[in-house]
Amino acid sequence: APVRSLNCTLRDSQQKSLVMSGPYELKALHLQGQDMEQQVVFSMSFVQGEESNDKIPVALGLKEKNLYLSCVLKDDKPTLQLESVDPKNYPKKKMEKRFVFNKIEINNKLEFESAQFPNWYISTSQAENMPVFLGGTKGGQDITDFTMQFVSS
């Protein structure tokens, strides 16, 4: 079934942008001016998820790349990765659970909770130039709040 999708960029609550760091990793750093063109453009899709009062299930792909953020266990720890998919089959309404994030909007801020690992969130570090990761704490040192910006084609 077709899905509703949009193109956007994400910045953490400290205004750090997300950029590629090697072929399968994202990092967060402050960008200005023309460097803003380096930031990753996501294709965010509305997918099927578990019933909830106000969490909206989404998948986060990299625009025009066959890569999706996914959550898997590595060394017994929930881990965020970029995973290659067959572009002929994605995005789809019934995404595998590892690709699904519960988008939570509070006061114009977004959180992305792993559907596979409840209470684990897409996170960035306070420090510059560090990998984007899956974190198991909210409200601590690590940043779990993001803002979204539509991308004009």
Epitope: L6, N7, D54, E105, S152
Partner: antibody, heavy 119, light 108 residues
Framework: EVQLVESGGGLVQPGGSLRLSCTAS????????MAWVRQAPGKGLEWVGI???????YYASWAKGRFTISRDTSKNTVYLQMNSLRAEDTAVYYC?????????????WGQGTLVTVSS | EIVMTQSPSTLSASVGDRVIITCQAS??????LSWYQQKPGKAPKLLIY???TLASGVPSRFSGSGSGAEFTLTISSLQPDDFATYYC??????????FGQGTKLTVK
């Protein structure tokens, strides 16, 4: 004050075109999803379509090909271009803001603008 | 495409009555359903989203329930301000966002 104001409605002949505008104040359209919903006189609500970023628009099956939604973020305005208009397109046209991205429901509505298609 | 069917189409009731309006989806939409109230000449007002969550500022006499394909809107004790037309809306079943045909609530 957060509000939406539609404009551009009026009388148009069958086969004609019209462009409706919806201007937002009190918030930025740069991260808001905006929909158009219409209501024929004495009838129910009918979803027309929705725009996210400028490349991501979705339409009711009956609206595809004749109706186009666009946005101008610098003017904080969303548009509905309507072509090949028919008598059955006569309706009040509302723009509305999606409550949250992909929530599919609409918490902020404009006052509506009446489009009459008649010769 | 998912079709939303409301019943009844019209409903006469008195102040203080308990009122129930039902909405049926042609296939399962989980809890992706909203309810709106509309008064003549006015824009619709969101009452309930995700089947059962009350929108901001909506009185607690309104409640929603259901999941899958069957949903209800209940007004526990009808007030004079509640006479209006009510619409259900599928908000999450695929690309399209479909409304029910409406239920007009009138004074008995």
């Amino acid at each position: 004050e957060v509000q939406l104001v539609e404009s551009g409605g009026g009388l148009v002949q069958p086969g004609g075109s019209l462009r409706l505008s919806c201007t937002a104040s009190g918030f930025s359209l740069s991260d808001a999803a905006m929909a158009w919903v219409r209501q024929a006189p004495g009838k129910g609500l009918e979803w027309v379509g929705i725009i996210y970023d400028s490349a991501s628009t979705y339409y009711a099956s009956w609206a595809k090909g004749r109706f186009t939604i666009s946005r101008d973020t610098s003017k904080n305005t969303v548009y509905l271009q309507m072509n090949s208009l028919r008598a059955e397109d006569t309706a009040v046209y509302y723009c509305a803001r999606e409550r949250q991205i992909f929530s599919g429901d609409f918490v902020l509505w404009g006052q509506g603008t009446l489009v009459t298609v008649s010769s | 495409e998912i079709v939303m069917t409301q019943s009844p189409s019209t409903l006469s009731a008195s102040v203080g009555d308990r009122v129930i309006i039902t909405c049926q989806a042609s296939q399962s939409i989980d809890n992706w359903l909203s309810w709106y109230q509309q008064k003549p000449g006015k824009a619709p007002k969101l009452l309930i989203y995700r089947a059962s969550t009350l929108a901001s500022g909506v009185p607690s006499r309104f409640s929603g329930s259901g999941s899958g394909a069957e949903f209800t809107l209940t007004i526990s004790s009808l007030q004079p301000d509640d006479f209006a037309t009510y619409y259900c809306q599928n908000t999450g079943g695929g690309i399209n966002i479909a409304f029910g045909q409406g239920t007009k609530l009138t004074v008995k």
